[in-house]
């Protein structure tokens, strides 16, 4: 009886198995009883990454300096090309088709984790003891100055915004 | 055992026809591809045409193309071969040939085929 | 349809001898190819099949390697029997064609 199922790396066409393209190849025509699957190789610029009977290769991604992009991986005939984010941007989604800027974090606000091509900038509200009095990608918040360690006085409270303000001890006459 | 037995080969004036016929023995005929292969005198082999198993497809070569026709009937156990508008460049052995992963692993002995006038 | 070409068309050896047959193929064919031996008055014979498996009953002496454009039948020790014609085939693109052939001859 004519087969049902195939092998691994194979597909069933006309009641036959035939061999899959391998990946970096495209199938040109279906195998006879006679001849074996025909397969060319993709082009420049294109792949296909697993065993296929694909009649078109892929385009490889395409990373556009507009959108913020540049190219991490330069693809082959078997892998597409991977794009990252320029310096200070990250992408946007998983298959990073665009990047947008790195946020910064405002004041009263320090960076707990500093973004990357595929991440943003993680901000987390300054406790208190710490303040952050800037808008900034890098910044993490400051503790506040130890007035006691430089035998001054806590003049003005420090707030999540701004640092202490230290003063010297008021003397006793 | 298996066995192929060709037969339909003699002389032919150019233009004419002919038909060769393959009878099959010794295994399960209808679940294999047949083909014809020819040998010119002297010469080297040339596939002339192929049909599927299970009635699947026919495929030839350019130089027969439009003119031979490949056919079986697996109720007899017989392979055909019509051959039309024969021509001198047609004068050769043919043999006919079981398929099995993408090999003739059994011949006929062959049946002379000339066209001459 | 694609060529294929036997090196060289015709060889003298003797009984013992290590002989090695060529086969070139106008494009790439991976490994989809066949050898045949063949003796004067009778049917081909399949020896090797995908470039490199012995057919079966099939004497060992006989190997075959290569892929791509680029294949070759051994005989590692040649036998009396041995004296005959070969012919590659390929199978990866329709029509199947064969080799010229090679004819093998006592020296």
């Known amino acids: 009886e004519p087969p049902t199922a195939c092998r691994e790396k194979q597909y069933l066409i006309n009641s036959q198995c035939c061999s899959l393209c391998q990946p970096g190849q495209k199938l040109v025509s279906d195998c006879t009883e006679f001849t074996e699957t025909e397969c060319l190789p993709c082009g420049e610029s294109e792949f296909l990454d697993t065993w296929n009977r694909e009649t078109h290769c892929h385009q490889h991604k395409y990373c556009d300096p507009n959108l913020g992009l540049r190219v991490q991986q330069k693809g082959t005939s078997e892998t597409d090309t991977i794009c990252t984010c320029k310096e200070g941007q990250h992408c946007t989604s998983k298959d990073c088709e665009a990047c947008v800027l790195h946020r910064s974090c405002s004041p009263g606000f320090g960076v707990k984790q500093i973004a990357t091509g595929v991440s943003d900038t993680i901000c987390e509200p300054c406790p208190v003891g710490f303040f952050s009095n800037v808008s900034s990608a890098f910044e993490k918040c400051h503790p506040w100055t130890s007035c006691e360690t430089k035998d001054l006085v806590v003049q003005q409270a420090g707030t999540n915004k701004t640092d202490v303000v230290c003063g010297p001890q008021d003397r006793l006459r | 055992e298996v066995q192929l037995l060709e037969s339909g080969g003699g002389l032919v004036q150019p233009g004419g026809s002919l038909r060769l016929s393959c009878a099959a023995s010794?295994?399960?005929?209808?679940?294999?591809?047949m083909s014809w292969v020819r040998q010119a005198p002297g010469k080297g082999l040339e596939w002339v045409s192929g049909i599927g198993s299970y009635g699947g497809g026919t495929y030839y070569a350019d130089s027969v193309k439009g003119r031979f026709t490949i056919s079986r009937d697996n109720s007899k156990n017989t392979l055909y071969l019509q051959m039309n508008s024969l021509r001198a460049e047609d004068t050769a052995v043919y043999y006919c040939?079981?398929?099995?992963?993408?090999?003739?692993?059994?011949w006929g002995q062959g049946t002379l085929v000339t066209v001459s006038s | 349809d694609i060529q294929m070409t036997q090196s060289p068309s015709s060889l003298s050896a003797s009984v013992g001898d290590r002989v090695t047959i060529t086969c070139r193929a106008s494009?790439?064919?991976?490994?989809?190819l066949n050898w045949y031996q063949q003796k004067p008055g009778k049917a081909p014979k399949l020896l090797i099949y995908a470039a490199s498996s012995l057919q079966s009953g099939v004497p060992s002496r006989f190997s075959g390697s290569g892929s791509g454009t680029d294949f070759t039948l051994t005989i590692s020790s040649l036998q009396p029997e041995d004296f005959a014609t070969y012919y590659c085939?390929?199978?990866?693109?329709?029509?199947?064609?064969f080799g010229q052939g090679t004819k093998l001859e006592i020296k």
């Open positions: 494009q790439s064919i991976s490994s989809y």
């Open positions: 085939q390929q199978y990866g693109r329709n029509p199947p064609t």
């Open positions: 010794g295994f399960t005929f209808s679940s294999y591809a």
């Open positions: 040939a079981r398929y099995v992963n993408f090999g003739m692993d059994y």
